[in-house]
């Protein structure tokens, strides 16, 4: 029968043993960084050669004994979760391990740094086709290691690391927390985070996805036919190993950005059990479960989007948190959140000639945390129109007046510390559905893009308050771009996009004891691209 | 590891030479930093990563590394260059006391100084 | 989804061989991970482990102090089940038989691998057996 | 053998009470400990892992904690269907062992 993990990666509609993947991972080489590993074990045997890079610290203790099948155990086990024969993901990749960690699991920074450079070096040496990295491997925070991650990921290579084992917030650990890099955690069976003896997977916003990491069958080093059980962060990072070797291998242009997006694209949505994150951390941490796509054509002409949290801004008065995209992706809205609702709203800036999205603590927050919409969008031409707080008792708007250009996105941000206080409300005019309002004491900002086919439309939802949560979607066909809250309520804490879902938050008046006047209402963009439809209708 | 860690009979103690001039001032205004993991345990003290500003030749990098030595020496203390970074970040690993930090933070072309610290398998 | 299904008779006579079988569906008997269990539940006793089966490579077994010497617990690859037998028995060994399963995997972190056993986590429905003439 | 002493042997309580059920080991297990729920004729189902993961399933009024040899489970709002026996399993060596049991019973 088929190991669960590998069902579960299935994409869904088809059975594991009757889906034909696109391709086995033929034309990728993926580099694993790791222990000494098996290579005649027969699950990888001709599939992984071992280099002859090795830069590990000694093991630590006298009695340690450096029994080969101890020393290849990790290394083995992740070799054939990628690529293994029968238990692998990727059966068709093709393999290259660095030795980094020692006979215990051990290593050092700067032996993965050496280790990243050497792979560099062989890159530059003898160029490839596509190349995943795998670090299977995390230690605290590395400013260092984050670097030069970062200087690979710019080279085209895609790296997959680990989240962690440590039940703690993903970001304090590295490589997971370096952005370019694609950090899993680790689900089970049932769907639920991973618990790893007394600790389990590491959460919050630097995982991107997680993907099956508990009582994952696959080579033991034990003997050339063995198997056993492994668990961990590392295993999951395995899988998205050899899912991103597949989807390289069938479209081996994709950047890191197009790879990235799609993994999360055709993730399962909403099937994690949130209630085993940490409160604060559920908001933050992606509830997606990498899965294979069911066919690598068709997913061109989706206009791609994804969320990026900021780190939280503290909670000084002029704190604010900054949530930047991808190199070649666009920021398409800005918005904010704050879990006191005290916040002076958001704005899109530039910061070295890109948008960034910054929002704005007040007195007496908690801090804010600032959410980017980042979307893949060719040849897109985008700018920020800002209208400054109005004079008249009608509220500021703001509109896209160039030729061309659609609404992606509205934030506002402003200078008085609460303005649900400043009467009145402000609400939209109706056949007006291209532009950004908010209230008087407010600067608007109108994200408004340029690309070719590129249409957009508005979709509300309103509920009379006090309402702790209210969603608007975007339907079927169409990508959510822009999130945001209509003015007219006291008690929002910020909107924030999941999924294709625009969410926005109100402080729970039961505590607050007040009662909100009008209504909470979520305020969504979706667009979608005709261009990207055709050109992929051209390729098939 | 290139050098295991008992070397110490290949350490050079550095004569003083023109590599050994008063280091450079490091630009105006930027004011190069040191990092060391939060987690205490997972610390390896005596190991640097001397991480230098992004254009950095790989001749600059080693004539850095020589200069470290150099000024190291003139203190009294071993050093010993365990590797010349370049091809993705330039710099060195170097393995010296922590008393040298505050003059390694003074090298011409010094970003930030990052003590080693272990990863683990997970 | 696993299942266990137990099968047996339900009277055993004194001194003879109390012989259960547990059929596994949803599951490999010669799972890497798992190990097959008998626990067995009696008023005097209350609930006791008895032993299990594994297989890594090989097979291997466990059983308890109170009942090895006596006991043997076997597996049927072709059937994809496992066998409880139990010697001698007398009327202490009347008692409720569930067959069980529990899984164990290694696991990484900054102190090495470990192996972490996850417990008794599925249960057979359970066969009365009373030891009487 | 490791011995796992479970009290009280049974309780009394009402609906919406919380109730508390501790296991103590004769040497440490770290959280090498699960705890399961009987109800008559039928098998122990499991509602903790771990000593304080919940298992798939099981509502969250259900939680355990504890490491080493002190543990408990705990009912935060007891709900007519939790009326049953409790019973603690220590799965740290290989020869494992069950707590006697705690009967929980309308007051």
């Known amino acids: 029968s088929i190991p669960w993990n590998l069902e579960r990666i299935t994409p869904p509609r088809y059975r594991a043993d009757e889906y034909q993947p696109p391709d086995g991972g033929s034309l990728v080489e993926v580099y694993l960084l790791d222990t000494s590993i098996q290579s005649d074990h027969r699950e990888i045997e001709g599939r992984v050669m071992v280099t002859d890079f090795e830069n590990v610290p000694e093991e630590d203790g006298t009695r340690f004994h450096r029994q080969a099948s101890k020393c290849d155990s990790h290394g083995t086990h992740l070799a054939g979760v990628v690529s293994g024969r029968d238990a692998g993901v990727a059966k068709g990749a093709s393999m290259r391990s660095l030795r980094v960690l020692n006979c215990q699991g051990k290593g050092t920074v700067s032996g993965t740094l050496i280790g990243l450079e050497f792979i560099r070096k062989s890159q530059l040496v003898q160029p490839v086709g596509p190349l995943v990295v795998l670090l299977p491997l995390a230690g605290g925070y590395s400013r260092v290691l984050n670097a030069a991650c970062q200087r690979l990921a710019r080279a085209g290579v895609v790296l997959v690391t680990a989240a962690g084992n440590f039940r703690d917030d993903a970001c304090l650990y590295s490589p997971a927390s370096a952005p370019e890099v694609i950090t899993v955690g680790a689900t089970n069976a049932q769907d639920q985070p991973v618990t790893l003896g007394t600790l389990g997977t590491n959460f919050g916003r630097c995982v991107d996805l997680f993907a099956p990491g508990e009582d994952i069958i696959g080579a033991s080093s034990y003997c050339s036919t063995c198997f056993v059980s492994q668990s961990g962060t590392s295993q999951a990072a395995a899988h998205v190993a050899g899912i991103a070797a597949m989807m390289l291998s069938a479209e081996p242009e994709l950047t890191l950005a197009e790879l990235r997006q799609r993994l999360i694209h055709f993730s399962a949505k909403d099937v994690i059990n949130e209630a085993w994150f940490p409160e604060d951390q559920r908001v933050l941490t992606p509830n997606l479960v990498a899965a294979l796509p069911p066919s690598t054509h068709g997913a061109g002409w989706q206009l791609f989007c994804r969320t990026v949290w900021s780190a939280h801004s503290g909670p000084t008065r002029m704190a604010t948190a900054v949530a930047r995209c991808a190199p070649d992706e666009e920021l398409l809205s800005c918005s904010s959140f704050s879990r006191s609702g005290k916040r002076r709203g958001e704005r899109m800036e530039a910061q070295g000639g890109k948008l960034v999205c910054r929002a704005h603590n007040a007195f007496g927050g908690e801090g804010v945390y600032a959410i980017a919409r980042c979307c893949l969008l060719p040849q897109a031409n985008c700018s920020v129109h800002t209208a400054p707080p109005a004079e008249a008792s009608m509220g500021t708007r703001v509109h896209c007046h160039q030729q061309g250009h659609v609404l992606t996105g509205c934030s506002s941000h402003w200078e008085v510390e609460d303005l649900g206080t400043h009467k009145p409300p402000v609400l939209r005019p109706r056949g007006q559905p291209n532009q950004c309002v908010g209230h008087r004491e407010a600067s608007i900002h109108a994200s408004c893009c340029h690309a070719p086919g590129l249409e957009c439309k508005v979709k509300e939802h309103g509920i009379p308050a006090p309402q702790e949560q209210v969603t608007v979607a975007c339907e079927e066909g169409w990508t959510l771009t822009g999130c945001s809250a209509l003015p007219g309520t006291s008690h929002v804490l910020g909107a924030y996009a999941v999924d294709n879902t625009c969410v926005v938050r109100s402080r729970d008046v039961s505590t607050t004891g007040s009662t909100s006047e009008g209504a909470v209402t979520a305020v969504a963009i979706c667009c979608r691209s005709r261009h990207l439809a055709q050109a992929s209708q051209e390729l098939q | 590891q290139e050098d295991e860690d008992g070397d110490y009979e290949e350490l050079v103690l550095a004569l003083r030479s023109e590599e050994d001039g008063l280091a450079e001032a490091p630009e105006h205004g930027t004011t190069a930093t040191f990092h060391r993991c939060a987690k205490d345990p997972w610390r390896l003290p005596g190991t640097y990563v001397v991480v230098l500003k992004e254009e950095t030749h790989l001749s600059q990098s080693e004539r850095t590394a020589r200069r470290l030595q150099a000024q190291a020496a003139r203190r009294g203390y071993l050093t010993k260059i365990l590797h010349v970074f370049h091809g993705l970040l330039p710099g060195f690993l170097v393995k010296m006391s922590g008393d040298l930090l505050e003059l390694a933070l003074k090298l011409p072309h010094v970003d930030y100084i990052e003590e080693d610290s272990s990863v683990f398998a997970q | 989804q696993l299942n266990l299904q137990q099968s047996g008779p339900g009277l055993v006579n004194p001194s003879q061989t109390l012989s259960l079988t547990c059929a596994i569906s949803?599951?490999?008997?010669?799972?890497?991970?798992?190990?097959w269990n008998w626990i067995r539940q009696s008023p005097s006793r209350g609930l006791e482990w008895l032993g299990r089966?594994?297989?890594?490579?090989?097979?291997?077994?466990d059983y308890a102090v109170s009942v090895k010497g006596r006991i043997t617990i076997n597996p049927d690859t072709s059937k994809n089940q496992f066998f409880l037998q139990l010697n001698s028995v007398t009327p202490e060994d009347t008692a409720v038989y569930y067959c069980?399963?529990?899984?164990?995997?290694?696991?990484?972190?900054?102190?090495?691998?470990?192996?972490?056993?996850?417990?008794?986590?599925?249960w057979g429905q359970g066969t009365t057996v009373t030891v009487s003439s | 053998d490791i011995q796992m002493t479970q009290s009280p042997s049974s309780l009394s309580a009402s609906v919406g009470d919380r109730v508390t059920i501790t296991c103590r080991a004769s040497?440490?297990?770290?959280?090498?400990l699960g705890w399961y729920q009987q109800k008559p004729g039928k098998a122990p189902k499991r509602l903790i892992y771990?000593?304080?993961s919940l298992q798939s399933g099981v509502p969250s009024r259900f939680s355990g904690s504890g490491s080493g040899t002190e543990f408990t489970l705990t009912i935060s709002s007891l709900q007519p269907e939790d009326f049953a026996t409790y019973y603690c399993?220590?799965?740290?060596?290989?020869?494992?062992?069950f707590g006697q049991g705690t009967k929980v019973e309308i007051k």
């Open positions: 069980a399963r529990d899984w164990e995997t290694i696991i990484w972190g900054d102190d090495g691998p470990n192996y972490y056993n996850y417990g008794l986590d599925v």
């Open positions: 949803g599951g490999s008997v010669s799972s890497n991970s798992a190990a």
């Open positions: 089966i594994y297989s890594r490579s090989k097979w291997y077994h």
């Open positions: 040497q440490g297990i770290r959280n090498d």
């Open positions: 771990g000593a304080s």
């Open positions: 399993l220590q799965h740290n060596n290989y020869l494992w062992t």
